[in-house]
Interface confidence: low
């Protein structure tokens, strides 16, 4: 045991990570054969490499080209669901419209989903301890250099409509320091992308405010447009309902708004 | 009929060994995740092995077994095994087969009538 | 791992009455949860799954709600085949998967 380590402000490395991160990996090579092709421990050993050894404030978007590379994976472009501080409902709503898809529903962002890793320089451990915090430490840390590495290609990927959920619960509905407001927004392709459409999700059972004219959204939609990409906006009153009509859109209250 | 048959239970000593099999039938054996459940007498479930599809490349074990026990797969028999080594009182257990799901949840949709391992001097 | 906590450990009901059981999960397991329904002597059986999803032949008396750490199974009108044990398993944070300890049924 080393007499001193260096302790970050954020918690430490996912207890069983290595083991995490292999079995989800092969559950979701065997759910999704156009993946079966993977090899999960190359996988592994890519993302270990991306960041053992290395000081955990010095990560770059080139240490992770190799995992980058072996989890390459062509998602429908027109299918695909952003989302900002709201991520249970997003992963609910695409798991009833199984025709699309968030980040989390590829093999990288399923992999890494909710987990925390890091190294330390030198030395080949993980270090479950501590974990630098993306504000109180450093920008570079592993994890957020993975989100940010991944956020951008799949808005890269992007085309023709393109969804975005968003929590009209937050004080900022729109928020330009999230992964969408920093990373996604800006890496969305003009020359492919038509639309953006928000979705913003009410939180308030008698919420009937038109949330789509908070100054954030109209924020976003200046941004957006200056990308010369069209923008729309929806209301979503009642996401059970949303969630509900998704499931069963013959049910005849579906045709109200929701 | 989807069906699980678990056999090769039984009476042994601490220390001992003993494997067992799970004939599967009714359904495309290979395409499917299968595990190891048991459950002590008078007690609830308790997880004890799983193995991947196809080949069964991948394993994974609870911790009370690593490295006593191991689980494989025969496609071409479409059985289970679980080799039990070193066996201990606290093994002593109903043992299942299940299957997994095979969609994006993985819990398990077919089980075995189970087998009774008693591991006693 | 992820630690289930069933209540209450035992229930005692009549027939026809309606049954709440729960599963606390001690982290975030989103929709990943399983209820199980087992009879003395018998191998459990799948009830429902991604916690509210019925598992194929299971009559729609039988719902599962919840997600993140709090789930319930009910049981609309207890019928005289639903007395047994019931049993909660996460398989969002694998290996290993676990289960919650039972809830038993029983008639009052």
């Known amino acids: 045991v080393p007499r001193w380590r260096q302790q970050w402000s954020g918690p430490g490395t996912t207890k069983r990570f290595p083991e995490t991160v292999l079995a989800r990996c092969v559950k979701y090579t065997e759910i999704h054969p156009e993946m079966r092709h993977v090899d999960c421990q190359s996988v592994w050993d890519a993302f270990k490499g991306a960041f053992i050894s290395k000081h955990p404030c010095n990560i770059t978007e080139e240490d992770y080209q190799p995992l980058m590379k072996l989890g390459t994976q062509t998602v429908p472009c027109n299918k695909i669901l952003l989302w900002s501080r709201i991520k249970d409902l997003a992963h609910q709503f695409t798991q009833v419209q199984r025709d699309m898809f968030t980040l989390e529903d590829t093999l990288l962002g399923y992999l890494a989903d909710d987990l925390t890793w890091c190294g330390e320089f030198n030395t080949s451990k993980i270090n479950y301890q501590s974990c630098p915090d993306w504000r109180k430490d450093c920008s570079n840390n592993p994890v957020s250099v993975f989100w940010k590495t991944v956020s951008r290609r799949f808005a890269e990927a992007a085309c023709d409509v393109v969804h975005v959920m968003l929590n009209g619960s937050r004080s900022k509905i729109f928020d330009k320091n999230s992964t969408f407001g920093s990373v996604e927004v800006h890496n969305l392709q003009p020359e492919k992308v038509q639309t953006l459409e928000a979705w913003v999700i009410h939180g308030g059972r008698e919420d009937s405010r038109d949330l789509c004219q908070d100054p954030t959204i109209k924020e976003l939609e200046s941004i957006i447009s200056k990308r010369n990409i069209q923008f729309s906006c929806k209301n979503i009153y009642r996401p059970d309902k949303f969630l509900q009509c998704v499931k069963n859109p013959e049910d005849s209250s579906c045709t109200s708004e929701i | 009929e989807v069906q699980l048959l678990e056999s090769g239970g039984g009476f042994v000593q601490p220390g001992g060994s003993l494997r067992l099999s799970c004939a599967a039938s009714g359904f495309t054996f290979t395409n499917y995740v299968m595990n190891w459940v048991r459950q002590a007498p008078g007690k609830g479930l308790e997880w004890v092995s799983s193995i991947s599809i196809s080949g069964g490349r991948y394993t994974w074990y609870a911790d009370s077994v690593k490295g006593r026990f191991t689980i494989s797969r025969d496609n071409s028999r479409n059985t289970l095994y679980l080799q039990m080594n070193s066996l201990r009182a606290e093994d002593t257990a109903i043992y299942y087969c299940a299957r997994e799901m095979n969609t994006y949840s993985f819990p398990m949709d077919v089980w075995g009538q189970g087998t009774t391992v008693t591991v006693s001097s | 791992e992820i630690v289930l906590t069933q209540s209450p450990g035992t229930l005692s009901l009549s027939p026809g009455e309606r049954a709440t059981l729960n599963c606390r999960a001690s982290q975030n397991v989103r929709s990943d949860l399983a209820w199980y329904q087992q009879k003395p002597g018998q191998a459990p059986r799948l009830l429902i799954y991604?916690?509210?999803n019925r598992a194929t032949g299971i009559p729609d008396r039988f719902s599962g709600s919840g997600s993140g750490t709090d789930f319930s199974l009910t049981i609309s009108r207890l019928e005289p085949e639903d007395f047994a044990v019931y049993y909660c398993?996460?398989?969002?944070?694998?290996?290993?998967?676990?289960f919650g300890g039972g809830t038993k049924v029983e008639i009052k």
């Open positions: 398993q996460q398989y969002y944070d694998w290996p290993p998967y676990t």
């Open positions: 991604d916690a509210s």
